[in-house]
C-alpha cells in the first residue's frame, strides 16, 4: 500500500526571461527513492538517479539546472515554457509517485510571486 504523498509548489508564475525552481517533496513513506524524472508533457527534462546522479536532456542543457535537492531550476524562461510539469518519483518498494506543477510564464514585469520556492 502506498502511504507517501507528494507536496509540490502547485500553480506558480514567473516573468519571461527569469528563472524558477520546480520543487517536489515526497513524505510519509520510508520507501527508497531510486530515481526522479522531471517531465513536461511528453518531453523528458531531467533525471536524478540515486546511483548515477543528474542527467539533463541535451535539448534542455542550456536552460535547465539540477537542484536544489531533487528540484529543477528553469532559466531564461519564455512564454512557451507555460504548462504542466511533472515530478515522477520511482521508489522501492512502493512504486511510482507523481506530482504536478503548473507554470505560467508572464510577459508583464509584474509576475505573481506567491510560490514559496520562487527565485526572486
Amino acid at each position: 500500500m502506498m502511504t507517501g504523498t507528494i507536496e509540490t509548489t502547485g500553480n506558480i508564475s514567473a516573468e519571461k526571461g527569469g528563472s524558477i525552481i520546480l520543487q517536489c517533496h515526497l513524505s510519509s513513506t520510508t520507501a527508497q527513492v531510486t530515481q526522479v524524472n522531471w517531465e513536461q508533457q511528453d518531453q523528458l527534462l531531467a533525471i536524478c538517479n540515486a546511483d548515477l546522479g543528474w542527467h539533463i536532456s541535451p535539448s534542455f542543457k542550456d536552460r535547465v539546472a539540477p537542484g536544489p535537492g531533487l528540484g529543477l531550476t528553469l532559466q531564461s524562461l519564455t512564454v512557451n515554457d507555460t504548462g504542466e510539469y511533472f515530478c515522477i518519483y520511482h521508489t522501492y518498494p512502493d512504486g511510482t509517485y507523481t506530482g504536478r506543477i503548473f507554470l505560467e510564464v508572464l510577459e508583464s514585469s509584474v509576475a505573481e510571486h506567491g510560490a514559496r520556492f520562487q527565485i526572486p
Epitope: M1, M2, T34, Q35, N37, D42, Q43, L44, I47, N49, D51, L52, H55, S57, F86, I88, H90, Y92, P93, D94, G95, T96, Y97, T98
Partner: antibody
C-alpha cells in the same frame, strides 16, 4: 510472491485483431508502470508499449513499429494490463511478455509469455 | 533511437571458465543500461542495472562494468545454470532498446 500471467495469444490472419491480457498478483498493481515486450527469432527482444498510472492520466507510449495499431490499457481494480492489437502483420509474430518497470528504467518481473502467430 | 550492438552473438565455454559479453551503444547511454539472462523456454530475468548494480539475488560471479557507449558483463567461474542467452537493454525518455543477444553454450 510476484506473478504476472499473460493470456490471449493464438493464431490470427494478417489484418486481424487480437487482445492480450495480463493479470498480476503479489504487489500493488496500481502503483507500477507496466509494459509489454515481445520476442521473435528474427527481431529478438523488442519493447512494445508502456502504460503509466492514474496519477499520470494513464499516459501511454509505443514503439514506432506498433504506433496507431496497438493500444495498451489497464484495469487497476482487476490488477490487469491489456494489449489490443489491430491490423496485425506477419512481423508481429512472437512471444509477448507483460513486464513491471523497476528503478524507472528496467524490467524486474516478467510473465511467462503468450505466443501470437500472424499467418494466413 | 539508440542502437545496442552485442558481441559476440554466440560463444562456447566450459564450467569454471570466465567469459565477457560486450554491448556497444550508438550514442551515450549515461549508464542507464541493464543486463538480462534468459534460459531456454523461460522469460528473461534482470541481472544487472545501472550498468554495474547487481539485481537482488544475483550471484557475485556476475559483474557489470562500463559507461557511455561501451559496456560489458563478466561471468567468472561459470556454473551449469549460467548457460543461456544474455541481453543488454537501455532506456531513455520514452523508449526501451535491447541488444541482439549473446547465446552462451556449453563447450
Amino acid at each position: 510472491q510476484v506473478q504476472l500471467l499473460e493470456s490471449g495469444g493464438g493464431l490470427v490472419q494478417p489484418g486481424g485483431s487480437m487482445k492480450l491480457s495480463c493479470v498480476v498478483s503479489g504487489f500493488t498493481f496500481s502503483n507500477y508502470w507496466m509494459n509489454w515486450v515481445r520476442q521473435s527469432p528474427e527481431k529478438g527482444l523488442e519493447w512494445v508499449a508502456e502504460i503509466r498510472l492514474k496519477s499520470n492520466n494513464y499516459a501511454t507510449h509505443y514503439a514506432e513499429s506498433v504506433k496507431g495499431r496497438f493500444a495498451i490499457s489497464r484495469d487497476d481494480s482487476k490488477s490487469s494490463v491489456y494489449l489490443q492489437m489491430n491490423n496485425l502483420r506477419a512481423e508481429d509474430t512472437g512471444v509477448y511478455y507483460c513486464t513491471r518497470l523497476y528503478y524507472g528504467n528496467y524490467f524486474d518481473y516478467w510473465g511467462q509469455g503468450t505466443t501470437l502467430t500472424v499467418s494466413s | 533511437d539508440i542502437q545496442m550492438t552485442q558481441s559476440p552473438a554466440s560463444l562456447s565455454a566450459s564450467v569454471g571458465e570466465t567469459v565477457t559479453i560486450t554491448c556497444r551503444a550508438s550514442e551515450n547511454t549515461y549508464s542507464y543500461l541493464a543486463w538480462y539472462q534468459q534460459k531456454q523456454g523461460k522469460s528473461p530475468q534482470l541481472l544487472v542495472y545501472n550498468a554495474k548494480t547487481l539485481a537482488e539475488g544475483v550471484p557475485s560471479r556476475f559483474s557489470g562494468s562500463g559507461s557511455g557507449t561501451q559496456f560489458s558483463l563478466k561471468i567468472t567461474s561459470l556454473q551449469p545454470e549460467d548457460f543461456g542467452s544474455y541481453y543488454c537493454q537501455h532506456h531513455y525518455a520514452f523508449s526501451y532498446t535491447f541488444g541482439g543477444g549473446t547465446k552462451l553454450e556449453m563447450k
